[in-house]
Amino acid sequence: RGVFRRDAHKSEVAHRFKDLGEENFKALVLIAFAQYLQQCPFEDHVKLVNEVTEFAKTCVADESAENCDKSLHTLFGDKLCTVATLRETYGEMADCCAKQEPERNECFLQHKDDNPNLPRLVRPEVDVMCTAFHDNEETFLKKYLYEIARRHPYFYAPELLFFAKRYKAAFTECCQAADKAACLLPKLDELRDEGKASSAKQRLKCASLQKFGERAFKAWAVARLSQRFPKAEFAEVSKLVTDLTKVHTECCHGDLLECADDRADLAKYICENQDSISSKLKECCEKPLLEKSHCIAEVENDEMPADLPSLAADFVESKDVCKNYAEAKDVFLGMFLYEYARRHPDYSVVLLLRLAKTYETTLEKCCAAADPHECYAKVFDEFKPLVEEPQNLIKQNCELFEQLGEYKFQNALLVRYTKKVPQVSTPTLVEVSRNLGKVGSKCCKHPEAKRMPCAEDYLSVVLNQLCVLHEKTPVSDRVTKCCTESLVNRRPCFSALEVDETYVPKEFNAETFTFHADICTLSEKERQIKKQTALVELVKHKPKATKEQLKAVMDDFAAFVEKCCKADDKETCFAEEGKKLVAASQAALGL
């Protein structure tokens, strides 16, 4: 039943070219190169991709041709190492080229930058975009792949092909519409937001594999697939988990051709075996490949089988608990996780993994005890506080969100997290807290049964963003500790952090609080970010400021911006009123 067992091929590059087709092959090679060399100009990448493609075609024609037997890492690495400006542009990354495979590829992977120093993507006027699309559709779409891939070096490559297909469809439809902007802009906004979410979700999968290992990823996959496919038997779920782990290991390791090929095979297998997997797959399986794979990945949970028996009989009361644990630890724990997850679509995956970890720890201790059964008899009682903690947290935060609305809820989180980890850079605190705050509008609208999986698994994705950004420039031992100790306990670890009493407040700098008339032309979102940046800086200057003090200063600040943006001479207003505001704020906060 191994989906991925293939005959050995003389030429791996020819094999993948034939499997994927020229269009997907070229797109995936471009994504791979842009994710590795994030600073290289578009034209350079296109040239490299064309050279690789021409080479692949010679191998398709004759698999025995020179160099066709080389591994994809060797071929792609050699090609990347021909870039003339490698040392000037990338510094020590150029040293990777002195290494042999597989060390060279590992070296490239280690130099992927989650926060590359690239300009923000500015959206041109609709007419300009439509002209560019019509003038050269192929280049226009390649540019999209390139710009997303270089900014998101772990973006799930086969899924990026799906985004590009939707991007093309949006332009094809809207550039012919009477009101191009009304048609196109909402579609581009949706793609941007979905793309950011997709990138962040995949980043967590890669972090899970790379920082915590295959076992951690497989545990996550068992829990999630068991919730999604509760009618599938454990053997089926195990097979899907093995195959899915291979796909994500490949994509996270830069093996994008193999990853896309194997993902297509997995979608094919799932659709051929729907009857033993899920009743919800029918519509997905009627779609073309890219849509099909996306649809399967997002498919709703199937209904739980009726009358599932109690877990206690097999996992607590049975005489064979310790025998099972001793004979096949991971399989037995996998079965426990499968059985628990399929009964609890209302739990977050991370909660299910905490329960499985508690069960494992208990058996580890009890199976060595004089009376194992007596020792582990009450193990399910230990689950109660673990379940109640996220339930209570979500209840409290949804109440706060409903009371404040998204912007003010984000501000509350900004203050909370700046006090916990004030050493973290202001842009990171703003970005992460804004995303944490979005949990409200994303999840609080759901009924109780869907709130926890929505909220806590989303928070895991956002906190991983904090972890990967912080890893690049570590500044806080507390962040490092919460990020590295346990993948499933990251959120409880951050929740448990109190105000950092060791933090020495930042020196006051008036420049940080000096604003200009350009703020008036910003979008509402950009204006919010400016205000939230100021709020973080305030807390860094005065970590002991009360909510009331901060609210008063922020209200004054909002009034100041509103007043000066209505003034005839905006710049003068910002200069004069700004000085007054800074003085008043210093007085209010006792700075």
């Epitope: 038997e233 053997a235 049975s318 064979d320 099972n324 004979e327 399989v331």
Partner: nanobody, 123 residues
Framework: QVQLVESGGGLVKPGGSLRLSCAAS????????AAWFRQAPGKEREFVSA???????TYADSVKGRFTISRDNAKNSLYLQMNSLRAEDTAVYYC?????????????????WGQGTLVTVSS
């Protein structure tokens, strides 16, 4: 609790074939190890074959190559296809199940048993 009921036994000539079935009820047993044992008149009950959650099968040397164990989890059933039957295969055949990841070969490891079905191989 799991209840097991065997069927399919009977009289067959040497060299013939039979297919035994075992229907489980009370709870799904797809993750359980399941096995066939047999007891000839005046002899100890002996292991014939077992199958685990992964559908990995093991056999007693005396039946290897002739008997095939299988399971249909959708039907919550276990089967034993017996070919090239010999007189010495005559016995009462029992179906057994236990929640074990690795399928045991010892009768004392099994928690649930059927009542048995008689197989007679005679010309």
């Amino acid at each position: 609790q799991v209840q097991l009921v065997e069927s399919g036994g009977g009289l067959v000539k040497p060299g013939g074939s039979l297919r035994l079935s075992c229907a489980a009820s009370g709870r799904p047993v797809s993750n359980y190890a399941a096995a066939w044992f047999r007891q000839a008149p005046g002899k100890e009950r002996e292991f014939v074959s077992a199958i685990n959650w992964q559908k990995t099968a093991t056999y007693a040397d005396s039946v290897k190559g002739r008997f095939t164990i299988s399971r249909d989890n959708a039907k919550n059933s276990l089967y034993l296809q017996m070919n090239s039957l010999r007189a010495e295969d005559t016995a009462v055949y029992y179906c057994a199940a236990v929640f074990r990841v690795v399928a045991p070969k010892t009768q004392y490891d099994y928690d649930y048993w059927g009542q048995g079905t008689l197989v007679t191989v005679s010309s």
